[in-house]
């Protein structure tokens, strides 16, 4: 051989949402003349590399990973060697190496990164009612399935950001998303507006959630 | 346990060729790259390329391109590294080491096994 | 050409821990360059330790661990016996060609 094949892939980490399809983009320059008969790919995950996907002989020898990847059989010829990934899992996130073997060989890494959006926060008060100012309040904003982690920011009407007295956790559930619960500590002035805002970093999607206190009765915005 | 045998030490003349087998015994070549490794006196290693015999492609380091050519036969678990136009400095001891292509037990564990050796003598 | 730079030489003492870089001239080391750490010692041929960044050859002994670590890829030994004392090479994975690192010489005092 007179050179190594050369395999590219994105740079750029491929996003893709909780349960949707998800091409994991890999491609060589064939030469003239070259036939499938002289290729072997292989998909693998970069770590261990474990078999995601091959094709040997002069064939597609299918998915090696619970039956959720295709290639683009009638792309191969041209030097797409991309993946298909089914209804994606946040197991599924990690690096993908893209192998390439004709007459040399090469590889190239591909990152997947997971993503799901934070459903709109839910806003509790404890106490919740006959409030008064100077009261200690516990205001909690709760948000549900997401992924990665979130990053949760507080403030007041005003826009001044609450960072003392908060205790934010997350738990992930079996499928690996997350569910946020931030609680505020506040003493009441004599009315307020408390804004909870949840972001997920990587789809920098920012889901909002208030609670206005004004005397007396509470009110809270209404669902948008 | 999968073992690499490689042929004995060779004295060779500067401008000829010198060819190292390196034998797998106790196990196949299926899902290995077996790579080629030199050593000069008092050098660190340096690889020289590889073969995937099961994928019958190679890659050569550029350093070597044109002046080395390794082979596999798969039948007897054999490869094969044949260097020409030796010089002196290409004195060295010779390594033949596996590394996985795909891990079936879903763990990578590199350059595990290395050969023990082949030492390359030029001179006049 | 790519370099890889490992330190020249290292001295601990039996029972300590010491951990060994390997820094790539491309830039950080990731998995996708699968980090193999290899032990040599005089008139042996070299051993396999680490494959995969981390992953330790079957016979490699618990105290070697691999990692990358700001950037480099890493080798640990905890608890140093005096037969760890050696030379050890890094060699790392760059899509169609493995390079190897200078080598660190191992002393243990």
């Known amino acids: 051989p007179t050179g190594a094949v050369e395999v590219q892939v994105p740079e750029d980490p491929v996003v893709a949402l909780v349960g949707t399809d998800a091409t994991l983009r890999c491609s060589f320059s064939p030469e003239p003349g070259f036939s499938l008969a002289q290729l072997n790919l292989i998909w693998q995950l970069t770590d261990t590399k474990q078999l995601v996907h091959s094709f040997t002989e002069g064939r597609d020898q299918g998915s090696a990973y619970a039956n959720r990847t295709a290639l683009f059989p009638d792309l191969l010829a041209q030097g797409n060697a991309s993946l298909r990934l089914q209804r994606v899992r946040v197991a599924d996130e990690g690096s993908f190496t893209c192998f390439v073997s004709i007459r040399d060989f090469g590889s190239a890494a591909v990152s997947l990164q997971v993503a799901a959006p934070y459903s709109k926060p839910s806003m509790t008060l404890e106490p919740n009612k006959d409030l008064r100012p100077g009261d200690t309040v516990t205001i909690t904003c709760s948000s549900y399935r997401g992924y990665p982690e979130a990053e949760v920011f507080w403030q007041d009407g005003q826009g001044v950001p609450l960072t003392g007295n908060v205790t934010t956790s997350q738990m992930a559930n079996e499928q690996g998303l997350f569910d946020v619960h931030s609680v505020l500590r506040v003493v009441l002035g004599a009315n307020g507006t408390y804004s909870c805002l949840v972001r997920n970093p990587v789809l920098q999607q920012d889901a909002h959630g208030s609670v206005t206190i004004t005397g007396q009765p509470m009110t809270f915005p209404p669902e948008a | 346990q999968v073992q690499l045998v490689q042929s004995g030490a060779e004295v060779k003349k500067p401008g000829s060729s010198v060819k190292v087998s390196c034998k797998a015994s106790g196990g196949t070549f299926s899902n290995y790259a077996i790579n080629w490794v030199r050593q000069a006196p008092g050098q660190g290693l340096e690889w020289m390329g590889g073969i995937i015999p099961g994928f019958y492609s190679l890659n050569y380091a550029q350093k070597f391109q044109g002046r080395v050519t390794i082979t596999a036969d798969e039948s007897t678990s054999t490869a094969y590294m044949e260097l020409s136009s030796l010089r002196s400095d290409d004195t060295a001891v010779y390594y033949c080491?596996?590394?996985?292509?795909?891990?079936?037990?879903?763990?990578?564990?590199?350059?595990?096994?290395w050969g023990q050796g082949t030492t390359v003598t030029v001179s006049s | 050409d790519i370099q890889m730079t490992q330190e020249p030489s290292l001295t601990t003492s039996p029972g300590g821990t010491v951990t060994l870089t390997c820094r790539s001239s491309?830039?950080?080391?990731?998995?996708?360059?699968?980090a193999n750490w290899v032990q040599e010692k005089p008139g042996q041929a070299p051993r396999g330790l680490i494959g995969?960044?981390?992953k330790r050859a079957p016979g490699t002994p618990a105290r070697f661990s691999g990692s990358l670590i700001g950037g480099k890829a890493a080798l640990t030994i905890t608890g140093v016996q005096p037969e760890d004392e050696a030379i050890y090479f890094c060699a790392l994975w760059y899509s169609n060609l493995w390079v190897f690192g200078g080598g660190t010489k191992l002393e243990i005092k």
């Open positions: 995969g960044t981390n």
């Open positions: 491309t830039g950080a080391v990731t998995t996708s360059n699968y």
């Open positions: 080491a596996r590394d996985q292509v795909v891990a079936t037990s879903g763990v990578n564990f590199g350059m595990d096994v």
